[in-house]
């Protein structure tokens, strides 16, 4: 069964800046990745970025840089200032859509005890 992993990290240099990394563990080819915060995209979450392997990347503030790391993993850097910036207990979700298998999603947040720069 395919799985999705999510890793959230606070940048040591900018304490209100976050990096979210997500990956898909499965055999299907990825058609679309959606990153959201505040919960899954279908349950009140707000879309931060949508990554398509052919048609490119769309991102919305406070997302600063979304990119593919591999064919089955992505990373997203969030801007750390402004009213819409994330806080330490924000939940981030990644949804990987693979055709014709379907979609798999997972969520993660920064562990309360983690120091800046450590992986979640």
């Amino acid at each position: 069964t395919p799985e999705v992993w999510v890793q959230v990290r606070m940048e040591a240099t900018e304490l209100s800046s976050f990096t979210i990394r997500c990956g898909f563990l499965g055999s299907g080819s990825i058609s679309l990745v959606t990153v959201s915060w505040g919960g899954p995209n279908g349950a009140g979450g707000t879309t931060l970025a949508v990554l398509h392997p052919e048609r490119g990347i769309r991102q919305w503030a406070p997302a600063r840089q979304a990119r593919w790391e591999t064919q089955s993993s992505i990373s997203l850097i969030l801007e750390g200032s402004g009213a819409s910036s994330p806080c330490a207990n924000t939940t981030f979700c990644c949804k990987f859509a693979s055709f014709p298998e379907g979609s798999w999603e997972a969520c993660g947040s920064l562990p309360p005890s983690s120091d800046p720069g450590l992986s979640a």
Epitope: S31, P40, G42, V50, R55, E101
Partner: antibody, heavy 120, light 107 residues
């Protein structure tokens, strides 16, 4: 303008074969996942077969596995459904449809359909 | 397979009425739900995708809502051209499955 035009339907005896075609135009055919959906007279919609834009990953309805084959010819902008060992219960209107990644794989464009009647 | 149960299976209404069709999934399908309209002898047409997004050219009287397992298609003020059969569909997990359809008829 996106257009999908099916052909190849007709009357065939049980155990016989048919090859359905779907001519696509108005979009980059190679970039989209495609499907065949059927509708028996007075009944609902049923996904029969689907093929990923990479032409590798496919899906088949359990009752047609081993009998039907979905394929496409990028050079001809055409989708095909080879149907062998046809049964009475395969009688239906067959539609080809395009899937849009950005719409959660919803089928955004459909052909007009072609009627397949399996009867002796 | 994920089952999509639509209700009602048929519905009689008048022009100007507000109509609601519901669809219940046998397990969570995230937001991967679409609604289609089909008229006799014609192919289905996409109305709504991702639960609540109207497809190009779809009038604003059509709206979708819901999350998880329960979804709704609402037509705020029925027009003569809206009398048709409506299908919900999930595209969360293969195989994509459809509801059995709701036939909307003129009262």
């Amino acid at each position: 303008e996106v257009q999908l035009v099916e052909s190849g339907g007709g009357l065939v005896q049980p155990g016989g074969s048919l090859r359905l075609s779907c001519a696509a135009s108005g979009f980059t055919f190679s970039s989209y996942h495609m499907s065949w959906v059927r509708q028996a007279p007075g009944k609902g919609l049923e996904l029969v077969a689907a093929i990923n834009s990479n032409d590798i990953n496919t899906y088949y309805l359990d009752t047609v596995k081993g009998r039907f084959t979905i394929s496409r010819d990028i050079a001809k902008n055409s989708l095909y459904l080879q149907m062998n060992s046809l049964r009475a219960e395969d009688t239906a209107v067959y539609y080809c449809a395009r899937h849009e990644d950005y719409y959660g794989f919803a089928m955004d464009y459909w052909g007009q359909g072609t009627l397949v009647t399996v009867s002796s | 397979d994920i089952q999509m149960t639509q209700s009602p299976s048929s519905l009689s209404a008048s022009v100007g009425d507000r109509v609601t069709i519901t669809c219940k999934a046998s397990q969570s399908v995230s937001n991967d739900v679409a609604w289609y309209q089909q008229k006799p002898g014609k192919a289905p047409k996409l109305l709504i995708y991702y639960v609540s997004n109207r497809f190009t050219g779809v009038p604003s009287r059509f709206s979708g809502s819901g999350s998880g397992t329960d979804f709704t298609l609402t037509i705020s003020s029925l027009q003569p051209e809206d009398f048709a059969t409506y299908f919900c569909q999930q595209a969360y997990r293969s195989p994509w499955t459809f509801g059995q359809g709701t036939k909307l008829e003129i009262k």
